[in-house]
């Protein structure tokens, strides 16, 4: 069947009315080799554009090749060429460029700061609960429980370094063995990839942008999940990570060295510590079954304290608790002994907003969560806008060619490995994989970086975060040096193993294909992105956690049938796409199942019903904000609302409600479901409140 014809513009100057229309056309010459390699698995998809109400639509000739939604957009340069500018114009242009750069760096700074505050907020909301996950004794015997605890704790505290440091202190104090700690570290690796997935959700306004951003973010998730899927059973069977790291740790005579360098933190800390400061030891203490820590607040009140070691008379249950008989005495009733007691004297209070409010941790956490998400969202929008205005025409071409083009033959294969090194290096500089991958996400969304290039950068980021951990381990005190180093090395070799599994051979780059698949679904049904986040990072881990607590028989009883069904579905799916003829007619497609079991359309209708009432106020709010935004920046159409809002306006127009026609439209991707019938997708199934 022929694809949808494109709608041309009868106006003499199309770009005058159709801003961003060109941005959706593929740049075939610039298309990277890697894109060619992997895209053959994708479903052909076509786009059409809705024009302003005053345009005349004319049919133009049908394109010979189908548009690929994964092609990078051409960012058209609408400005005057440099050579055509006068001296004043050139100076103005330079100042504009500098201004944009300063703004970009400023928003980037607040973006990173908001990620830090977001982590603090999550720790305040869920930190204590996360700490209690660790105090579960079943972790020792159940690697699956260890894995989900790693995921949940990292998701709740939004920081893999926090969960890793808890594990280190537990191993150092013999509450946990290295063997039991490895699955937790694997889980922490998965949990840390939620941050950039949340960041991707902020780009939900533009379908094509969201498709790329969400796929770019979830490529990290899929890499981690797939690595665990293969490497956890291997580790349980062979203990290779434990053995290899043990050999490395024992072969070196380490002296604890300098502290790991704080690079990005040097700039962000002065700001973030004015907002909130946390006493992260509290979570570790809860994890180590310290009852007193449960009543302590995570919000740091005293920043300058004086710790004095003094000998104090304390009561003990019996003479057996005395270090020596001569150091014990009685008051006639109780037995007393002399102990070295660390006495802490508070000298100066911290200088952050919440220091004198004495609010409960949950309240502070919720306040910071809302603020940091708003700042994160705002910064992201502004970063995308600034980048969008900077990366046009020639600049965009140069940048995209530099980032996405491979080395000349026969060294093309080296490009990806260089990207891994760049990712590792950049992560080492910013000291956080979350920050690096979150900064990468909007760049993927606006089409500066392809997913094929983002993938090795993300893998490098995984390596970079472990090198930071190794440095931190080498700087740790003697009593924790061995355990922290071994755990950091386990983390490092786990990521190396994952890369060896899912990167060297293009065929094995399964995370890219899976992320693209999820990107396509999420672009069409935007609620599915949130659904994915909840299921993969909360529901599945919590279910496994619950089943694990119930014991092995229950876990196996529920798990085996579920795994069997998943394998069955995957095998059937593979046969349907590769060799359907070997299957009976009924099994050649999923139509034998109820629609709700093989299509998201009915679910979309249900969700649209629920989200419908919220759509109108949301869109009104968006329009008001956009008007304000456009007034502030002085350009007539710098901001646009989501496609949902525009669909809503059209619906109202059809019912006779006069609404000002929107100025620009998103593209609509017609999926396989819609290709069967030549009609524009109805707003009910296409649009949700997301």
């Amino acid at each position: 069947m022929a694809p949808w014809p494109e709608l041309g513009d009868a106006q003499p100057n199309p770009s005058k009315y159709l801003e961003g229309a060109t941005s959706q056309q593929p740049i075939t010459p610039d298309k990277s080799k890697e894109t060619n390699k992997t895209d053959n698995t994708e479903v052909p998809v076509t786009k059409f554009e809705l024009l302003p109400t005053y345009s005349t639509a004319t049919l133009i000739e049908e394109p010979t090749e189908v548009d690929d939604p994964w092609n990078l957009p051409t960012l058209q340069d609408s400005g005057i060429k440099w050579s055509e500018r006068d001296a004043k114009g050139k100076i103005l242009c330079v100042f504009q460029g500098i201004g944009r750069l300063i703004l970009l760096l400023g928003f980037l700074y607040f973006f990173v700061c908001s990620l830090d505050v977001l982590s603090s907020a999550f720790q305040l909301v869920g930190g204590k609960m996360a700490g209690q996950f660790f105090s579960n004794s079943s972790i020792m015997s159940n690697p699956l429980l260890g894995l989900v605890i790693g995921v949940l704790v990292t998701v709740f505290v939004q920081s893999s370094s926090t969960s890793t440091s808890i594990v280190v202190s537990m191993v150092a104090s013999s509450l946990l063995t290295v063997r039991a700690a490895i699955p937790i570290i694997m889980g922490a690796n998965i949990g840390t990839s939620i941050t950039n997935t949340i960041v991707a959700l902020m780009q939900v306004g533009d379908r094509s942008e969201f498709r790329r951003a969400f796929a770019g973010a979830t490529v990290h998730d899929f890499f981690n999940w797939l690595s665990v899927l293969v490497l956890l059973p291997v580790e349980v069977a062979t203990h290779y990570l434990e053995v290899v790291t043990q050999l490395i740790v024992e072969s070196f005579h380490f002296k604890n060295g300098e502290d790991a360098p704080d690079l990005l933190k040097v700039i962000t800390k002065p700001f973030t510590k004015l907002i909130v400061q946390l006493d992260k030891k509290v979570i570790s203490q809860i994890a180590m079954n310290d009852e007193t820590a449960k009543n302590k607040s995570l919000v740091k009140i005293w920043c300058k304290t004086f710790t004095n070691m003094t000998q104090m008379n304390v009561t003990v249950p019996s003479m057996a608790n005395c270090t020596s008989h001569s150091l014990c005495w009685t008051d006639g009733i109780q037995i007393w002994t002399m102990k070295n007691v660390t006495y802490k004297e508070n000298i100066a209070k911290c200088q952050h907003i919440f220091v004198n409010f004495h609010l409960p941790d949950l309240a502070v956490g919720i306040i910071l969560l809302i603020i940091s998400l708003l700042v994160l969202c705002g910064c992201l929008i502004m970063i995308v806008k600034i980048l969008g205005s900077v990366l046009k025409g020639q600049v965009a071409t140069v940048i995209k060619k530099t980032i996405n083009t491979d080395f000349p033959f026969p060294f093309a294969w080296l490009t990806g490995y260089l990207a891994i090194l760049v990712g590792a290096g950049m992560t080492f500089i910013v000291q956080s994989s979350s920050v690096f991958t979150s900064a990468l996400t909007p760049l993927i969304g606006i089409g500066v970086i392809t997913i094929e290039r983002a993938y090795p950068l993300t893998l490098g980021s995984n390596i970079g975060t472990t090198t930071t951990a190794i440095l931190a381990a080498l700087a740790s005190p003697g009593n924790t040096l061995r355990s922290s180093l071994q755990i950091a090395l386990c983390h490092f070799f786990f990521n190396i193993s994952g890369i060896l599994l899912w990167y060297p051979i293009p065929f094995t780059r399964l995370p890219i294909r899976m992320a693209k698949g999820l990107g396509n679904i999420s672009a069409k049904y935007r609620w599915f992105a949130v659904f994915y986040l909840i299921i993969f990072f909360f529901l599945i881990p919590l279910t496994v956690f619950g089943l694990s607590l119930a014991g092995w028989p229950v876990l196996v009883g529920v798990g085996v049938p579920v795994v069997f069904i998943i394998i069955l579905v995957l095998c059937l799916r593979l046969l349907q796409s590769r060799c359907p003829r070997v299957l009976p007619k009924k099994l050649q497609n999923w139509n034998f199942l109820p629609l709700c079991m093989h299509s998201l359309k009915p679910w979309d209708a249900v969700i649209s019903k629920f989200t419908g009432p919220f759509q109108m106020p949301c869109c009104c709010c968006c329009r008001v904000c956009c008007r304000v935004c456009c007034l502030l920046c002085g350009c007539p159409k710098c901001c646009r609302c989501s496609k949902c809002c525009q669909d809503l306006e059209e619906g109202q127009e059809a019912q006779g409600v006069p609404v000002k026609a929107p100025e620009t439209f998103d593209n609509i991707t017609i999926s396989r479901e819609a290709q069967g019938e030549v009609r524009a997708p109805d707003s009910k199934t296409e649009c949700t409140a997301l």
């Epitope: 001569s326 005495w329 009733i333």
Partner: antibody, heavy 119, light 107 residues
């Protein structure tokens, strides 16, 4: 200043019981242990036991277990010792003494109650 | 029970003399030892605790020394008002025990 007041003498018949008091003032009654000490010319000073008025916890010398019962009344800041099934050996001077906080030295002593067991 | 042995029942000294009263514990009591003075017809009075620490209001002519099992109580410049019985007491473990006492007399 710290004061511990005890009645001067108690005359009791053999087999009977006696409950002697020790009224305190000048300090917080519930913060220090109250010890009871027996003094006889032949045996010297013997520790009977102690009570912590704060929670009523007691400790006894094995020799006096079952013979002496220590109690304390926080409202009147008074400590009591009851001696039961008295014999002539129980004839002695009984002191109440305040224990120093955190150890077993006794810093303030009552004047002592002289118990005479006689038929 | 820990037995506290005061080897001298009586000690005779002139005013201005120095007197050393000894006390031996049957086992190690660290420094959990107190010294008391009891004048005729009066209740005991605390002089020294923790083997060496003078109680408040006690003149500095009274000193204590020793640790473990051997303890010494010294009056460096005997005064007439110092005539009394002197007891040692251990509070290393229950039951608390006292020495039999040493009577200081004037020559």
């Amino acid at each position: 200043q710290v004061q511990l007041q005890q009645p001067g003498a108690e005359l009791v018949k053999p087999g009977a019981s006696v409950k002697m008091s020790c009224k305190t003032s000048g300090y917080t009654f519930t913060t220090n242990n109250m010890h009871w000490v027996k003094q006889t010319p032949g045996q010297g000073l013997e520790w009977i036991g102690a009570i912590y008025p704060g929670n009523g916890a007691t400790a006894y010398n094995q020799k006096f277990k079952g013979k002496a019962t220590l109690t304390a009344d926080k409202s009147s800041s008074t400590a009591y010792m009851q001696l039961s099934s008295l014999t002539s050996e129980a004839s002695a001077v009984y002191y109440c003494a305040r224990g120093m906080y955190g150890h077993g030295a006794m810093d303030y002593w009552g004047q002592g109650t002289s118990v005479i067991v006689s038929s | 029970d820990i037995v506290m042995t005061q080897s001298h029942k009586f000690m005779s000294r002139s005013v201005g003399d120095r007197v050393r009263i000894t006390c031996k514990a049957s086992q190690d009591v660290g420094t959990a030892v107190a010294w008391y003075q009891q004048k005729p017809g009066q209740s005991p009075k605390l002089l020294i605790y923790w083997a060496t620490t003078r109680h408040s209001g006690v003149p500095d002519r009274f000193t204590g020394s020793g640790s473990g099992t051997d303890f010494i109580f010294t009056i460096s410049n005997v005064q007439s008002e110092d005539l009394a019985d002197y007891f040692c007491q251990q509070y290393s473990s229950n039951p608390l025990t006292f020495g039999a006492g040493t009577k200081l007399e004037l020559k």
